[in-house]
Each structure stands twice: as structure tokens, then as C-alpha cells.
């Protein structure tokens, strides 16, 4: 019952798909599938995604588009890049706050909130490694600040304060006993 | 034993609404696509709705496109095409056929037909 | 739409000889060596019934003397020898690309 020839397009392609009757094209990256097509190997009517969504693949057979994510507000977020037909959103931390995840596994796609940076300067500390992705890694002391307890404490400015030998080594007094 | 029994049609107004439908027995229903082909009066053919085997897609020509819905009930083996805003010029016998796939993906035959219904559109 | 002809109309032919009916399409309805091209009887009160496909495959079933052939735009249908029982209508029908459209038709006679 079934003919010997067997025409070329046989699904197995990376760009066709058996969708209804025929192997058809895939769609381009920010369109979705409105009908298939309507002979073998050709092209599936593909429309651009509607406002607020997208498709991010080539040569998909999607007959919908993905909603647009919308960065949560409450953990701080804002949006990097807008979404578009061909990408999503990019939501991160806005310019001074870092991403903390909220899992222990944490990949691109894990949820997050942002945290403000920790400023160095405020702690009358160097700079380390700046925030971005981590928090900021504060270093020694400022010049005219010595470490005491875990903090940075003002070199004394005259001779009647006391100077603790770290203070000494660091302010240049010397012990005044 | 392949057989398709169409029922459903009969006389209706201009504007008037009709539904068809077509009892499959002696094969597996649901692995193949279906159609509905209608003969006019003066014996032209005419291919009005075509339906895939998983009921996902449905294709129709131009002259019926908004007008005719083909759908299937996978379950009770039947096949419809309910039609509205019928015309004059849809007066015709009405076929379902079962469509073969001769090569894969490729190549449809309709290779078992009902004995039709008949529809007569008239005021 | 692909347009389908056939010719002629309808022709009468004595028993036992031969006889081609023609069906020619508006457009190519060949893809990658094989003819989507199927021709169909039918007799007075009852469906179409499938004789041949891919222009040229016989279906299960039918008498050997039907025969196809054919390739891109022009195709026929060859019965040899007509006998009495083949008297009927002959349509072609394409499945390249939808719509699926249809030759308007062969009325054969037998004398």
C-alpha cells in the first residue's frame, strides 16, 4: 500500500517538525506559531509575539509566547534590560546593592533579592573588591585610622590622647609614658 | 471492515445552520487525519475541511473558512463539521473521507469515503 | 489554489479497447521525485473510490488493467481494456498543497 519513493523532508531535520498534517518550518525567535503550513517542508504562518512577551528560539514550533517576567519590587529588584519579542526581561540590583539568592544552589535563573552594599568608606576602611555580584570586601584601615575591636578608630590629634601600640605603629606616636 | 456513515443534513434556510456528522468503525479513528469533501449538483468536488489525526489543526479552503468547523471525538469515533451562514452554493452531498498517509508526513489519500449526506440550502 | 483540467469531458468507447483520460495542473505538483496525484472513480448513487496515487502507485484492490503515469504538470489515467463495469466518472485529484482541489471530471461510456 505505500510507494517506494520517499520525498526528501522527513521530520528528522533540525528546522521541521510534523505539526498537523505536514513536516513544516519552524518559526523565527519573537514570533509564535498561528497556523502550520499548509504543504510539505514549508513555511508555518508565524506572527510576532504580542506586547509583553517573547520567544527566544529559532526555528520553534511554539504556538505561544512566554509572558514577560516581571522583576519583584519587594526584594529590590529592577530591570536591567527590558523585555523584548526575543528576550526576557533581565531583572538584577540596581547601582550600590548586590544579589543575595535565595538558594543554597545558586544559578541564573535561582530567585534573588538585592541587599544594599556595604559601604568601605562609611567603616573608614579601603575598598577591597568592589559590590557586584557579592557584597563588598572592605580592606585595612584608611590612613589616619588604626584598627581597634573590629572597627577603624581616628588617630588621636594631640599628645594627650592615650595611643595603644597599634595606634603607635600606624599614627606614628610614639608611647607617652 | 472500513466504514464511514455520514448523517445530519437536510433542508435549511439562506443564513441557516447545519451539523454533520460521521460515525467511523473497522480502524483505528484517532491515528488518522480526516476530511469532509462535498459534490455539488452539477458533480464537481469539492475538499471543504480537513482535520489532523490528534484534533490540534484544522485546515479549510478559502470558500468556507469562518463559516464550517470540522472538529472530532476521538473517544466516540466520530467526526463533525457543523456549518453556519450557509449559502445556496453550499447545496451539495456531503462526504467524509479518510486520509491515508501514503508517504510519511507527506502525501494524503483519501482512500475510504461515506456514502454522504445530502444538504440543500433554500428558502 | 492549484487548478486541475481534465480532458475530455466524457468520451465513449467500445469494450475491450483502450482508452487515456488527461489532467493537467496549473503548477508542478511533483516534490523531490514523487507526483501527488491521485485519480478516483465514481459510479452513479455511491462515493468516490480510490484508484491510484503518487500518479502512478495502484491502490490495494484495484483491477490491474487501471494504470497511471505522469510527472510534473501533465498526468493520465489509462484503462486497458475498458470492460462494461468501468463505465463511470474519473477525477483527479492533487494533494501537493492545500487546498486539495479536484478535475472537474471524466464521464466515461462504454458501447
Known amino acids: 500500500q505505500g510507494g517506494t519513493r520517499s520525498p526528501r523532508c522527513d521530520c528528522a531535520g533540525d528546522f521541521h517538525k510534523k505539526i498537523g498534517l505536514f513536516c513544516c518550518r519552524g518559526c523565527p525567535a519573537g514570533h509564535y506559531l498561528k497556523a502550520p503550513c499548509t504543504e510539505p517542508c514549508g513555511n508555518s504562518t508565524c506572527l510576532v509575539c504580542p506586547q509583553d512577551t517573547f520567544l527566544a528560539w529559532e526555528n520553534h514550533h511554539n504556538s505561544e509566547c512566554a509572558r514577560c517576567q516581571a522583576c519583584d519590587e519587594q526584594a529590590s529588584q529592577v530591570a536591567l534590560e527590558n523585555c523584548s519579542a526575543v528576550a526576557d526581561t533581565r531583572c538584577g540590583c540596581k547601582p550600590g546593592w548586590f544579589v543575595e539568592c535565595q538558594v543554597s544552589q545558586c544559578v541564573s535563573s535561582s530567585p534573588f533579592y538585592c541587599q544594599p552594599c556595604l559601604d568601605c568608606g562609611a567603616l573608614h576602611r579601603h575598598t577591597r573588591l568592589l559590590c557586584s555580584r557579592r557584597d563588598t570586601d572592605c580592606g585595612t584601615c584608611l590612613p589616619g585610622f588604626y584598627e581597634h575591636g573590629d572597627g577603624c578608630v581616628s588617630c588621636p590629634t594631640s599628645t594627650l590622647g592615650s595611643c595603644p601600640e597599634r595606634c603607635a605603629a600606624v599614627c606614628g606616636w610614639r608611647q607617652m609614658f | 471492515e472500513v466504514q464511514l456513515v455520514e448523517s445530519g443534513g437536510g433542508l435549511v434556510k439562506p443564513g441557516g445552520s447545519l451539523k454533520l456528522s460521521c460515525a467511523a468503525s473497522?480502524?483505528?479513528?484517532?491515528?488518522?487525519?480526516m476530511s469532509w469533501v462535498r459534490q455539488s449538483p452539477d458533480k464537481r468536488l469539492e475538499w471543504v475541511a480537513e482535520i489532523s489525526s490528534g484534533d490540534t489543526y484544522t485546515y479549510y479552503p478559502d470558500t468556507v473558512t469562518g463559516r464550517f468547523t470540522i472538529s472530532r471525538d476521538n473517544a466516540k469515533k466520530t467526526l463533525y463539521l457543523e456549518m453556519s451562514g450557509l449559502r445556496s452554493e453550499d447545496t451539495a452531498m456531503y462526504y467524509c473521507?479518510?486520509?491515508?498517509?501514503?508517504?510519511?508526513?507527506?502525501?494524503?489519500?483519501?482512500?475510504?469515503w461515506g456514502q454522504g449526506t445530502s444538504v440543500t440550502v433554500s428558502s | 489554489d492549484i487548478v486541475l483540467t481534465q480532458s475530455p469531458a466524457s468520451l465513449a468507447v467500445s469494450l475491450g479497447l483502450s482508452v487515456t483520460i488527461s489532467c493537467r495542473a496549473s503548477?508542478?505538483?511533483?516534490?523531490?521525485?514523487?507526483?501527488?496525484l491521485q485519480w478516483y472513480q465514481q459510479k452513479p448513487g455511491q462515493p468516490p473510490r480510490l484508484l491510484i496515487y503518487?500518479?502512478?502507485t495502484v491502490e490495494s484492490g484495484v483491477p490491474a488493467r487501471f494504470s497511471g503515469s505522469g510527472s510534473g504538470t501533465d498526468f493520465s489515467l489509462n484503462i486497458h481494456p475498458v470492460e462494461e463495469d468501468d463505465s463511470a466518472m474519473y477525477f483527479c485529484q492533487q494533494s501537493r498543497r492545500l487546498p486539495w482541489t479536484f478535475g472537474g471530471g471524466t464521464k466515461l461510456e462504454i458501447k
Open positions: 503548477e508542478s505538483i511533483e516534490y523531490s521525485g514523487t507526483s501527488f
Open positions: 473521507a479518510r486520509d491515508r498517509e501514503a508517504y510519511y508526513g507527506q502525501q494524503y489519500v483519501m482512500d475510504y
Open positions: 503518487g500518479s502512478s
Open positions: 473497522g480502524f483505528t479513528f484517532s491515528s488518522y487525519a
